[in-house]
């Protein structure tokens, strides 16, 4: 028998989403206008390509990366697209209100779209921990809260700690990971009897997840360099990210084989670990002076990722109810922390080199920045989790977790589609 949306959600979701969309359209109408000063059309196209790379990463990369569940692949891809589309709209407005609004209208530039796409990417990283256990109405709430929290975090960090766009956006890895994990912690955990098969991966969805990983792998240098100020910084970021992800692929595949008693390679490990270098190198990608350092970082990140994928899922599954294949959350939390630690080391070296007696102060500031990102992620994540538990959202019953048939109309009703 085909599973239907509960009647109340069938009324609630379109009403909730379309009302929100109408509100966003009104906000855009009253408060925004385009940057009218674009003189150079060739330059415009070149600048747009960076945004295009980010959109490909978000829609195809993260969309397909989370689609490895046997019975939840459609929902993973489409819900990701839905969240991206909504998240970008709200992020553009929010960023404009927080940074430009006192001067009048919010000016929309390609740069603001770039920032918004990256903010929305945060939600797509976080949602990996809860996908399959929530419906679209709940995901709308998650998008709104997370984009708002990240926008405010970036504003606070920018004003208090004087960090540039790149540095305060690179907290996205740690922020998104901890946000997602704390939301997952709030949601009902036990998978009832008979649903265990649904959170298992299947060959075709796993292949599409690998496709997602490949897209992310190809475009990660664009992500790490998108917000950098000068061509030399972007060049360094692209090169260092490329070296790091290249090494993490080799490490992921060989490490995965090493971790298996029969020397077999785990798809789940590879999906996530191929990206490890890109995450770990993110914060300092433009500062690393030579390729070998980026490669070492990629190697360490790959090993941490494979190690984490081997030993953490049991714990995460028990405590947070996160399925074995959703390893992005704890992966990004570990690798994001590694990246932040690398940056703090660079900061210490810099301060010592300058003969500045303020080493402790600088390190304290950086640790404060990181701590603030984690605290805001955890607090806003817990708030979101509590909101998602409200009855009004008509969350899927636990027996319907990881089931496309709850959300999609299929021409056939075969269970093993």
């Amino acid at each position: 028998m085909s599973s239907k949306y509960p009647r109340s959600v069938r009324r609630c979701l379109p009403l909730w989403a379309l009302t929100l969309e109408a509100a966003l359209i009104l906000l855009f109408y009253f408060f925004t206008h385009y940057d009218a000063s674009l003189e150079d059309q060739k330059g415009l196209v070149a600048s747009y390509q960076v945004g295009q790379d980010l959109t490909v990463m978000a829609a195809i990369g993260l969309g397909f990366l989370t689609s490895s569940f046997r019975r939840h692949s459609w929902s993973s891809v489409a819900f990701n697209l839905f969240m991206l589309a909504l998240g970008v709209q709200w992020a553009i407005l929010l960023d404009g209100f927080l940074s430009q609004f006192p001067s009048g209208k919010v000016v929309i530039t390609l740069f603001s779209i770039r920032l918004a796409t990256m903010s929305a990417l945060s939600v797509l990283i976080s949602v990996d921990a809860v996908l399959g256990k929530v419906n679209l109405a709940q995901l709308v709430v998650m998008v709104l809260v997370e984009v708002t929290a990240l926008g405010n975090l970036r504003m606070v960090i920018s004003n208090i700690f004087n960090t540039d766009y790149h540095m305060n956006m690179m907290h996205i890895y740690v922020f998104a990971a901890y946000f997602g994990l704390s939301v997952a912690w709030c949601l009902p955990k036990p998978l009832p009897e008979g649903t265990e098969d649904k959170d298992q991966t299947a060959t075709i969805p796993s292949l599409s997840a690998m496709l997602g990983a490949l897209f992310l792998w190809m475009f990660w240098p664009s992500f790490n360099s998108a917000l950098l100020r000068s061509p030399i910084e972007r060049k360094n970021a692209v090169f260092n990210t490329y070296y790091a992800v290249a090494v993490s692929v080799v490490t992921a595949i060989s490490g995965s084989s090493l971790a298996h008693p029969q020397g077999k390679i785990s798809k789940t490990y590879v999906h996530s670990a191929v990206l490890a270098g890109g995450v770990a190198v993110g914060t300092s990608c433009h500062l690393i002076p030579s390729p070998w350092l980026a490669m070492v970082l990629g190697l360490v990140a790959g090993l941490i990722s494979v190690g984490g994928a081997k030993y953490l899922p049991g714990c995460c599954n028990r405590v947070l109810g996160i399925p074995h294949s959703s390893i992005m959350g704890y992966n990004f939390s570990l690798l994001g922390l590694l990246g932040e630690i690398i940056y703090i080391v660079l900061l210490v070296l810099d301060t010592v080199g300058a003969g500045n007696g303020m080493i402790g102060f600088q390190v304290l500031l950086s640790i404060g920045e990181l701590s603030l990102a984690i605290v805001i992620a955890l607090m806003s994540g817990l708030l979101t989790g509590l909101l998602l538990n409200l009855k009004i959202w008509k969350a899927p019953h636990e027996a319907k977790y990881f089931d496309d048939q709850v959300f999609w109309k299929f021409p056939h009703l075969a269970v093993g589609f």
Epitope: G43, S47, T109, D164, R229, S230, E233, L349, N356
Partner: antibody, heavy 125, light 105 residues
């Protein structure tokens, strides 16, 4: 050699508009961030606006936000400053300047290494 | 806020001159020094607090980090009489000091 040449200055009434241009030569214009800095008569230097090398990001001092717009045309090696709703306090010599980046260990350091000769803007009724 | 001292300074050719610049917050080494002569554009002397711009005579030197910075001219030459500005690029908006006018005694 590396040169920046401003033009477009003049006398304008309060509330009027003016568009300044800065033509670059002797270097790869599209690879550098650019700035406008002004100096009121008998006063010090005041930073006004910046634009990234690819034109994707811009920033302004609070006193000109919403009135001034910085832009660039990399195909013409030209930087612009569109000034609207001009006030008496906008009277100054306007300089364009090139931004250079130096890699530090934990952050890049930016500075203005090449300046134009300046163009004078007078806002008076 | 960048505060320069002194506001003006009289010195003779051959003197050693020191101009100081104080930042209202820690700006690490994100400081530049410029020289401006009447009717001309500013000229970069020192960047990153202590690095000498190419083409600038070695009698100019910069030092400091954090909040206190100094520009030193070891042996004053006739062409050095001008106004000197410090400028921070640590946080937006970039700000300049009010300037120090160096005059002939």
């Amino acid at each position: 050699q590396v040169k920046l040449l401003e033009s477009g200055g003049g006398v304008v009434q309060p509330g009027g508009s003016l568009r300044l241009s800065c033509v670059a030569s002797g270097f790869t214009f599209r690879s550098y961030g650019m700035h406008w800095v002004r100096q009121a008569p008998g006063k010090g230097l005041e930073w006004v606006a910046f634009i990234w090398f690819d034109g994707s990001n811009k920033g302004y001092v609070d006193s000109v936000k919403g009135r001034f717009t910085i832009s660039r045309d990399n195909s013409k090696n030209t930087l612009y400053l569109q000034m609207k709703s001009l006030r008496a306090e906008d009277t100054a010599v306007y300089y364009c300047a090139r931004e250079k980046a130096l890699r530090g260990i934990s952050r890049y350091n930016y500075y203005l290494d090449v300046w134009g000769k300046g163009t004078t803007v007078t806002v008076s009724s | 806020v960048m505060t320069q001292s002194p506001f003006s300074l009289s010195a003779s050719v051959g003197d050693r001159v020191t101009i100081t610049c104080r930042a209202s917050q820690n700006i690490r080494s994100f400081l530049s020094w410029y020289q401006q002569k009447p009717g001309t554009a500013p000229k970069l002397l020192i960047y990153a607090a202590s690095r000498l711009q190419s083409g600038v005579p070695s009698r100019f030197s910069g030092s400091g980090s954090g909040t206190d910075f100094t520009l030193t001219i070891s042996t004053l030459q006739p062409e050095d009489f001008a106004t000197y500005y410090c400028q921070q690029s640590y946080s937006a908006p970039w700000t300049f000091g009010q300037g120090t006018k160096l005059e002939i005694k």
